[in-house]
Interface confidence: low
Amino acid sequence: DGCKDIFMKNEILSASQPFAFNCTFPPITSGEVSVTWYKNSSKIPVSKIIQSRIHQDETWILFLPMEWGDSGVYQCVIKGRDSCHRIHVNLTVFEKHWCDTSIGGLPNLSDEYKQILHLGKDDSLTCHLHFPKSCVLGPIKWYKDCNEIKGERFTVLETRLLVSNVSAEDRGNYACQAILTHSGKQYEVLNGITVSITERAGYGGSVPKIIYPKNHSIEVQLGTTLIVDCNVTDTKDNTNLRCWRVNNTLVDDYYDESKRIREGVETHVSFREHNLYTVNITFLEVKMEDYGLPFMCHAGVSTAYIILQLPAPDFRAY
């Protein structure tokens, strides 16, 4: 069929709860492309009717909720004007017996479900929730050994649980829970997280490395839309937060009312020794006030900025 296979992604998922997967592969999906989802080499595309339990939502495939029979290989076909690429996603669905210690936990946990806290430090756990914008997520609750987490040492901040002065007792089985609303219906999203404690400050005390940006300026026309990626490499066991800030404030908070500048959803690619993270910042419309202001990408203790600059006037036009 002339489509080039890009990669196979394996996902192990809990039954009876929502799941979504975004068919994105920069730079292919950055241009003018059409995305179509199929199941198990079927010639019939996944439904786009939002009332369907399984349907395509823009570039996403959305399961509301996931069920036993949904295990299998799904293909996402990305067609451009002169190209065709295919991503294979192997989904394995299992029944998670929450709070039942007599039955084992999650099989073959992916990195998102295994997290590390550093002894004696202030650290954090992340609740990985990846859904299309048609899904509205409520506030996140955190549980440890099936009891809701409360106490002065714990603070819930957006998708993270901040833990101050980590102790050995903080190891164990955690879960983050959110209520997802889609088309007037509500579903529970639950992620189990196995937490271990380490005294190391990461691999040899290494710090995240920001590949891009590199403390530079970008020429951009007034009124245009701009998307800038922050690319970070970090150790696989890291618990660092990656975010964009302006004037020492998270961009989503700084532009809370206008929502003109927003931080994107973080994605990552896993390599043998490290992870490559990408989190973008989107300027829906560049305004005069944006020029000359450092927009900072933070990754743990590492920072890098971009400064927007008006293009030099092109005198050849006169």
């Epitope: 909720p65 929450w98 609750k141 509500q186």
Partner: nanobody
Amino acid sequence: DVQLVESGGGLVQPGGSLRLSCAASGYSYRTQCLGWYRQAPGKQLEAVATISGGGTSTYYSDSVKGRFTISQDNAKTTVYLQMNSLRAEDTAVYYCAAGLSVLGSWCHGGSSYEYTYSGQGTLVTVSS
């Protein structure tokens, strides 16, 4: 509006059986935990049995283990409580409850009843 309607209660002799049903209507979401609770005259509300939305995870209080069975229909909109070998101490008003979360102690027999909805109750009297 969400409604949970219990039925199947009544008078039964010790050693007898009853099957309670709870029909849920008006649900705007897929419930993750359904359960039965009971309250005997002058006693505290007690968790009897709960079942997860997937149907594979169940909880029974020690007082009913081996005698009561909780189940649900394929559509997961009705939950049943099959009660065998009934005793006088099983006399109580039985309430059906439903909630979004399989976490939190309520779904596992804890005393913090964090369920989202509950019914009006059905009276079970075990007497000779």
